[in-house]
């Protein structure tokens, strides 16, 4: 029987009965938060052989071994993981051994066994026989091995029953408990599983099998299971499902996600029955089960319960992440915030269509509306009183609507209203009328020419650059001296610059009124000599990097015909010169014969130009005498050079620091103080432990269902 989707056993140990007939758990298995110590000896689930996702055990009092519960658990597939782990055993106060003596394969993911004060038989299990890679395993804070005295079956009687393998250069017996060896298949089987009698299974079997070389006798399948047979790929007209079995179209057509309150149904894509079309694809029609590629970003319709969505913070904007069509009205009211422009762009930048109206009021933090960088249509199906579908009121720092040279926005129905936007030039509003097709809809009072743009330099003159010089990390630019009608009104210039890999930046990118700005700013005083052109040396730049630069004149707010005059340049794109690249990364060398070396490396992280070739130098080194100090034919252990790995288990450091013989002298030395790198590694380790524990708690402590 296939059980699932995911089984969560908590609070009451009798819930374990839910596992009674399960052979495969399609999903995860959680056993957790059972605080009353119980006798688990009457609970045994010999039918369970496979868990397709992960196994999590957390705070189960009284449970001393998993071997009696799951004597035949053979494979944990790890199709979905718990924080990168397929097996998590955490804070199991009474667990004495893992005891999963039939566990032969964890297909994906690592293991995390942490804070189990009584847990032994960890150093006797060779996880490399079960997992592909053991480097990500995390086994920390359990009972110290010195206190365990783990003995494998038959060792005391000097008739050892288990096989030996090498872990961390220790060749030893491998077992799960005092009476259960760790099963190993004959080397003749290679990567294949084997029966209890050491006969090799069919290549499509995983973990074990009941008969040799038979694809219908597998305990679990290496690839996919279909109609009692393990197959390398799903047969025609069947589809991969949940990473382990093949299902037909009818099955896929009738299932729904239990995680959603909609009934959208699964889709078939690329031979797989899946919950959603993958990124970049969309369902091919409402009744379709198939996916087609999206043109541009995939549409995502978002709807607001109350018809009007108020965006007054980054948190409220977050709800719109990924939305391309917003059914309803947008009310934007951003009075303050940190890095607000780029945050809003991140969460609202994909919106293309708003079906109702857009209202921006009291948004003093906004300098531009360019964060709505894909908005192309306001339908105006619902309008504000007075038939307005675009309403902009009292935004003290709003200077730009959009970059109209690169923007197509249509307002299908309704009028526009602009008032009390002191830094928004009326010319900018008129330009919006032209682009959006609303010209002629507005009445005289809808666009107030007196209180829009009254504090902006709307009549801008253009500053022209006169020269540019570059080096690897500097740019020198000069520009024409700006001469306003009254020379005294010119105070200084401000140069704005930033990295711009593409020539598509605008003045207002990433800028808000609360101090966030993606542009670097430098003030340039007027040269005292009236005949000298103003200029600047920008230094500390990156080699071979394109920068965008523009200059603004800082003038007195001199009003002339109700408007302030100002001046600024176009945006100039300029690239610094190339320089010496940084060193090539990850250099590895290996010998593949007595006369050859293979050397591999990755490109430098900072090429600082277009790389054309590499220079490889080599020289012969004298042989290391260390290699001759040991008789490799003797049975003694081969000496191992130990390198500090920078991490320690705090709980296990109980002895005094060891003294070592140093240098040529025979006297003892103190243990060396920890290096900065070691301290940093310890700090990161502690941080990582906290992050995992938070993730665990957030995942499993959930509100009680109503």
């Amino acid at each position: 029987e296939i059980c699932g989707p995911g089984i969560d056993i908590r609070n009451d140990y009798q819930q374990l009965k839910r596992l009674e007939n399960c052979t495969v758990i399609e999903g995860y298995l959680h056993i957790l938060l059972i605080s009353k110590a119980e006798d688990y000896r009457s609970y045994r689930f010999p039918k369970l052989t496979v868990i397709t996702e992960y196994l999590l055990l957390f705070r189960v009092a009284g449970l001393e071994s998993l071997g009696d519960l799951f004597p035949n658990l053979t494979v944990i597939r790890g199709w979905k993981l718990f924080y990168n782990y397929a097996l998590v055993i955490f804070e199991m106060t009474n667990l004495k051994d893992i005891g999963l003596y039939n566990l032969r394969n964890i297909t994906r993911g690592a293991i995390r066994i942490e804070k189990n004060a009584d847990l032994c038989y960890l150093s006797t299990v060779d996880w490399s026989l079960i997992l592909d890679a053991v480097s990500n395993n995390y086994i920390v804070g359990n009972k110290p091995p010195k206190e365990c005295g783990d003995l494998c079956p038959g060792t005391m009687e000097e008739k050892p029953m288990c096989e030996k393998t090498t872990i961390n250069n220790e060749y030893n017996y491998r077992c799960w408990t005092t009476n259960r060896c760790q099963k190993m298949c004959p080397s003749t089987c290679g990567k294949r599983a084997c029966t209890e009698n050491n006969e090799c299974c069919h290549p499509e079997c995983l973990g074990s099998c009941s008969a040799p070389d038979n694809d219908t006798a597998c305990v679990a399948c290496r690839h996919y299971y279909y109609a009692g047979v393990c197959v390398p790929a799903c047969p025609p007209n069947t589809y991969r499902f949940e990473g382990w079995r093949c299902v037909d179209r009818d099955f896929c057509a009738n299932i729904l996600s239990a995680e959603s309150s909609d009934s959208e149904g699964f889709v078939i894509h690329d031979g797989e029955c899946m919950q959603e079309c993958p990124s970049g694809f969309i369902r091919n029609g409402s009744q379709s089960m198939y996916c087609i590629p999206c043109e541009g970003p995939c549409p995502k319709v978002c709807e607001e319960e109350k018809k009007t969505k108020t965006i007054d913070s980054v948190t409220s904007a977050q709800m719109l992440q990924g939305c391309t069509i917003f059914k309803g009205n947008l009310l934007i009211n951003i009075r303050r915030g940190n890095n607000i422009a780029s945050e809003l762009e991140n969460f609202m930048g994909l919106i293309e269509v708003v079906t109702g109206y857009v209202k921006i009021r009291h948004s003093h933090a906004l300098v531009s509306l360019s964060f709505l960088k894909n908005l192309r249509l306001i339908l105006g199906e619902e309008q504000l009183e007075g038939n307005y579908s675009f309403y902009v009121l009292d935004n003290q720092n709003l200077q730009q609507l959009w970059d109209w040279d690169h923007r197509n926005l249509t307002i299908k129905a309704g009028k526009m209203y602009f008032a009390f936007n002191p830094k928004l030039c009326v010319s900018e509003i008129y330009r919006m009328e032209e682009v959006t097709g609303t010209k002629g809809r507005q009445s005289k009072g809808d666009i107030n020419t007196r209180n829009n743009g009254e504090r902006a330099s709307c009549e801008s003159d253009v500053l022209h650059f006169t020269s540019t010089t570059t080096s690897k990390n500097r740019i020198i630019i000069t520009w024409h001296r700006y001469r306003p009608p009254d020379y005294r009104d010119l105070i200084s210039f401000t140069v704005y610059y930033k990295e711009a890999p593409f020539k598509n930046v605008t003045e207002y990118d990433g800028q808000d009124a609360c101090g966030s700005n993606s542009w670097n700013m430098v003030d340039v005083d007027l040269p005292p000599n009236k005949d000298v052109e103003p200029g600047i040396l920008l230094h500390g730049l990156k080699p071979w990097t394109q920068y965008a630069v523009y200059v603004k004149a800082v003038t007195l707010t001199m009003v002339e015909n109700d408007h302030i005059r100002g001046a600024k340049s176009e945006i100039l794109y300029i690239r610094t010169n190339a320089s010496v690249p940084s060193i090539p990364l990850d250099v590895l060398s290996a010998s593949n014969s007595s006369s050859q070396l293979i050397v591999k490396w990755n490109p430098p992280s900072l090429p600082n130009g277009n790389l054309s070739y590499y220079i490889v130098r080599w020289q012969r080194q004298p042989q290391d005498g260390y290699l001759y100090r040991h008789n490799y034919c003797s049975k003694d252990k081969i000496p191992i050079r130990k390198y500090a790995d920078g991490t320690i288990d705090i709980e296990e450091v109980t002895e005094n620091p060891k003294t070592e013989v140093c240098g040529g002298e025979k006297g003892p030395c103190c243990a060396c103080p920890k290096t900065e790198a070691e301290k940093q590694a310890e700090k990161e380790e502690a941080e990582y432990r906290k992050v995992f524990e938070n993730f665990l708690h957030n995942s499993i402590f959930v509100p009680r269902p109503e």
């Epitope: 009738n254 299932i255 409402s286």
Partner: nanobody, 128 residues
Framework: EVQLVESGGGLVQPGGSLRLSCTAS????????MAWFRQAPGKEREGVSA????????YYADSVKGRFTISRDNAKNTLYLQMNSLRAEDTAVYYC?????????????????????WGQGTLVTVSS
Amino acid sequence: EVQLVESGGGLVQPGGSLRLSCTASGLTFGTFGMAWFRQAPGKEREGVSAISASSGRTYYADSVKGRFTISRDNAKNTLYLQMNSLRAEDTAVYYCAVRSKNGAGYGFWYEARLYGYWGQGTLVTVSS
């Protein structure tokens, strides 16, 4: 509080038609999947038809395919089931149900566990 009220049931002759309605209140109707179930005397409750909220994708039990049509009007918060070519075996109490989030994984559209809210039901009798 979520409330579902079914209507439109009654006595009809074999081959006849009926249209059931289910009006919902207390929820954002346009975001929930919905379904019709039925329970004949002495039998298990079974799924008849379901419909998604976002795309209107529909599902039907084999026994009603081609005869019944499910639809919804999100503006009126109403779910419909148009039943044509009725047969005696269609006699049952028909229930309207609303989807709910139900943990991880998946389930078949006709599994009652996927639905969190239920109406009181309306009786449909097909008899000559």
